[in-house]
């Protein structure tokens, strides 16, 4: 496959990446109310998010909650928050550098310098991906760890929510497609040493005989 | 041996606030969730409220909701309860208690509160 | 919430004699997840804080006199007391340990 096509394709599932990590940290679904038992006959499922807490009756209506008070949220979700919208923000920061770095683009000149920009939005996108990994996974071993747990109450339990899914597809996606950013910008190089151009010594002048030394040829 | 030992109880005006301490010993206390039990004069018990582990989730009977908080210092091995806009009704003997699995397993001697003008 | 209905409210007994409490909740306590029912008891002498006798509704804690038997399931539940003895006079609460609010019965009270 050409750099161009990875390039293109390394950019498309970040973009769907970015937009499932959008979408991850705006719906209240990161938790849900566990149903254990039989006997415990409820009206209404409970949603916890990021940002809003929402209430679903059997009826099908549902009323949401924003919360009020940032000192009030658990540590999970307080850092779920920072780390999440870093990493949505980060994502934005990496589509222009990919952009800029991207051969159908003329931001930057053609050449190494182009390739180590491209390079850069593909591990941005990496760490992107890892830096949402960390909020989702630490809020999902929360969950599962409490559902466990016999000494919490048994409506105090939950399990994982819809928005932790899409989150880790959101992430694999980023992170994916953040390999083939880094794949493009290396093919498109030809040489793995993206670090600093290759210098080379300016030709001496010609020998007697009018030759140049061979040596100086590459 | 496990001993709780509960202080700071007294007698106080509707409206006003007490902090209750309960001093915990004899067990690893950062591995239980905490608990504190109230018994009004010769009446029966009513929970009040939980703590987890660490301090991070507490859960409250709808009596005290918003106007108790149940809080922890695992390094001092603490459990407390800040108690505001106390009322007559709130007068008891307030039992810490070890929670595990739900249930209470040991008790503090318990403190007498007492809410009057 | 889960009431919790105890009965009787006071009962006269002699040492000896078995002596059975009973307890009924307004919802089952049975867990079909984990296979449980989630109901202890405990005893309070005068003057004293109470004292945990059984757990998850048959399970004494250690410590405990095996006279002291807990039975039941579902919504109905009993303290049977083997052989009464002069230090069992106290009042005994059933209690739910199954979800919050933990709710207490109103208890029953053994008196000579």
């Known amino acids: 496959m050409g750099s161009a096509a990875l390039e293109i394709l390394g950019l498309v599932l970040c973009l769907v990446g970015w937009g499932g990590l959008i979408l991850a940290c705006g719906l209240p679904m990161w938790q849900v109310t566990a149903f254990l038992d039989h006997n415990i006959v409820t009206a209404q499922t409970t949603w916890k998010g990021l940002w809003m807490s929402c209430v679903v009756q059997s009826t099908g209506h549902m009323q949401c909650k924003v919360y009020d008070s940032v000192l009030a949220l658990s540590t999970e979700v307080q850092a779920a928050r920072a780390l999440t919208v870093s990493a949505v923000l980060l994502a934005f920061v990496a589509l222009f550098v990919t952009l800029a770095g991207a051969q159908c683009t003329t931001c930057v000149a053609p050449g190494p310098a182009k390739a180590r920009v491209a390079l850069t939005g593909g591990v941005l996108y990496l760490f992107c991906g890892l830096l949402a990994l960390v909020p989702l996974c630490w809020f999902a071993n929360i969950v599962v760890r409490e559902f466990y747990d016999p000494s919490v109450p048994v409506s105090q339990k939950y399990e994982l929510g819809a928005a932790l899914y899409i989150g880790w597809a959101a992430t694999a996606l980023l992170m994916v497609g953040g390999c083939l950013l880094c794949c493009g910008a290396w093919v498109c190089t030809g040489r793995p040493d993206l670090s600093f151009p290759v210098k080379y010594s300016a030709p001496r002048r010609p020998t007697a005989t009018g030759d140049y030394d061979k040596k100086n040829y590459v | 041996e496990v001993q709780l030992v509960e202080s700071g109880g007294g007698l106080v005006q509707p409206g006003r606030s007490l902090k209750l301490s309960c001093a915990a010993s004899g067990f690893t206390f950062s591995d239980y969730f905490m608990a504190w039990v109230r018994q009004a004069p010769k009446k029966g018990l009513e929970w009040v409220a939980s703590i987890n582990y660490e301090g991070s989730r507490t859960y409250y009977g709808d009596s005290v909701k918003d106007r108790f908080t149940i809080s922890r210092d695992n390094t001092k091995t603490t459990l407390y309860l800040q108690m505001t806009s106390l009322r007559s009704e709130d007068t008891a003997t307030y039992y810490c208690?070890?929670?595990?699995?739900?249930?209470?397993?040991?008790w503090g001697q318990g403190v007498m509160v007492t809410v009057s003008s | 919430d889960i009431v919790m209905t105890q009965s009787p409210s006071s009962l006269a007994v002699s040492a000896g004699e078995t002596v059975t409490i009973n307890c009924k909740s307004s919802r089952s306590l049975f867990s079909s997840g984990y296979q449980e029912n989630y109901l202890a008891w405990y005893q309070q002498k005068p003057g004293q804080s109470p004292k945990m006798l059984i757990y998850l509704a048959s399970t004494r804690e250690s410590g405990v006199p095996d006279r002291f038997i807990g039975s039941g399931s579902g919504t109905d539940f009993t303290l049977t007391i083997n052989t009464l003895q002069a230090e069992d006079l106290a009042i005994y609460y059933c209690q739910q340990h199954y979800d919050i609010p933990y709710t207490f019965g109103a208890g029953t009270k053994l008196e000579l």
């Open positions: 208690a070890r929670h595990p699995r739900r249930y209470f397993d040991f």
